[in-house]
Interface confidence: low
Amino acid sequence: MGRARDAILDALENLTAEELKKFKLKLLSVPLREGYGRIPRGALLSMDALDLTDKLVSFYLETYGAELTANVLRDMGLQEMAGQLQAATHQ
């Protein structure tokens, strides 16, 4: 318990400021699994990595939150980071 959250935080903290901005923009439009809601734009854009991690886990729980984060990172071209996140959550 908590491993996925730590892995999400580690990934987000390793993004540059510009990349974190890109991540948030992508999160606003990424397809979601049925039954899950979208984090409100207003709240999302002002969050730092720590707040965003907490929000991702509260909205999507740890497992899906990590999967969603990895998907967005992959769409940003950050395959390596996405892979590291997924590896960390499946240990």
């Epitope: 390793n14 540059t16 510009e18 990349e19 890109k22 923009l25 992508k26 990424v30 992959r74 769409d75 940003m76 071209g77 950050l78 395959q79 390596e80």
Partner: antibody, heavy 114, light 106 residues
């Protein structure tokens, strides 16, 4: 400031190998991947592959898997691309760039000629 | 690998004219990147994540699209916009480029 300084122009013989370099400065080398792109004269861009200096992991375009080998030396903050079994088709400008936010080197011109 | 087809391959536009370059993708991707390149220089990222302008890019540029169809638009062509533009996908390896659109000023 971030800089990627690429090696000088190279002239090589058909069948030979050549190793191009890309020296990074102004940032932590291991925090970003480096990718390489080929551009023949008057032609478009071809993505060759990328390397992550922290782990040494590499990802290749299958079209270049038998042609290029990517390596990185953390101690000198330098990425390398070795091209082997050179032919005239390998004559091109080769660019290196920082993977995440697209800082590009100035390019290295490789000419393969007998 | 994912194939990106740009059109037109070459075009001319008068100052003030609206210009649209399209990038058709063989398999659906989530986002598109656009690069500008002028002769003898390295490519510059121009638009990232489909619609976000890179730092220093004039507001007359815009990007849009989804799935298998993306575009770059210049609302009013200026002489400094003459260049070759490339689209690129980063959704799956290898990160392929389009063949380029050479934009000339009339």
């Amino acid at each position: 400031q971030v800089q990627l300084q690429q090696s000088e122009a190279e002239l090589a013989r058909p069948g030979a190998s050549v190793k191009l370099s890309c020296k990074a400065s102004g940032y932590t080398f291991t925090s970003y991947g480096i990718f390489w792109v080929k551009q023949r004269t008057g032609q478009g861009l071809e993505w060759i592959g990328e390397i992550y200096p922290r782990s040494g992991n590499t990802y290749y375009n299958e079209n270049f898997r038998d042609k290029a080998t990517l390596t990185a030396d953390k101690s000198s903050s330098t990425a390398y691309m070795e091209l082997r079994s050179l032919t005239s088709e390998d004559s091109a400008v080769y660019f290196c760039a920082r993977q995440r936010d697209d800082y590009w080197g100035q390019g290295t011109t490789l000419t393969v000629s007998s | 690998q994912i194939v990106l087809t740009q059109s037109p391959a070459i075009m001319s536009a008068s100052p003030g004219e609206k210009v649209t370059i399209t990038c058709s993708v063989s398999s659906s991707v989530s986002y598109m990147y656009w690069f500008q390149q002028k002769p003898g220089t390295s490519p510059k990222v121009w638009i990232y994540s489909t619609s976000n302008l890179a730092s220093g890019v004039p507001a007359r540029f815009s990007g849009r699209g989804s799935g298998t169809s993306y575009s770059l638009t210049i609302s009013r062509m200026e002489a400094e916009d003459a260049a070759t533009y490339y689209c690129q996908q980063r959704s799956s390896y290898p990160f392929t480029f389009g063949s380029g659109t050479k934009l000339e000023i009339k």
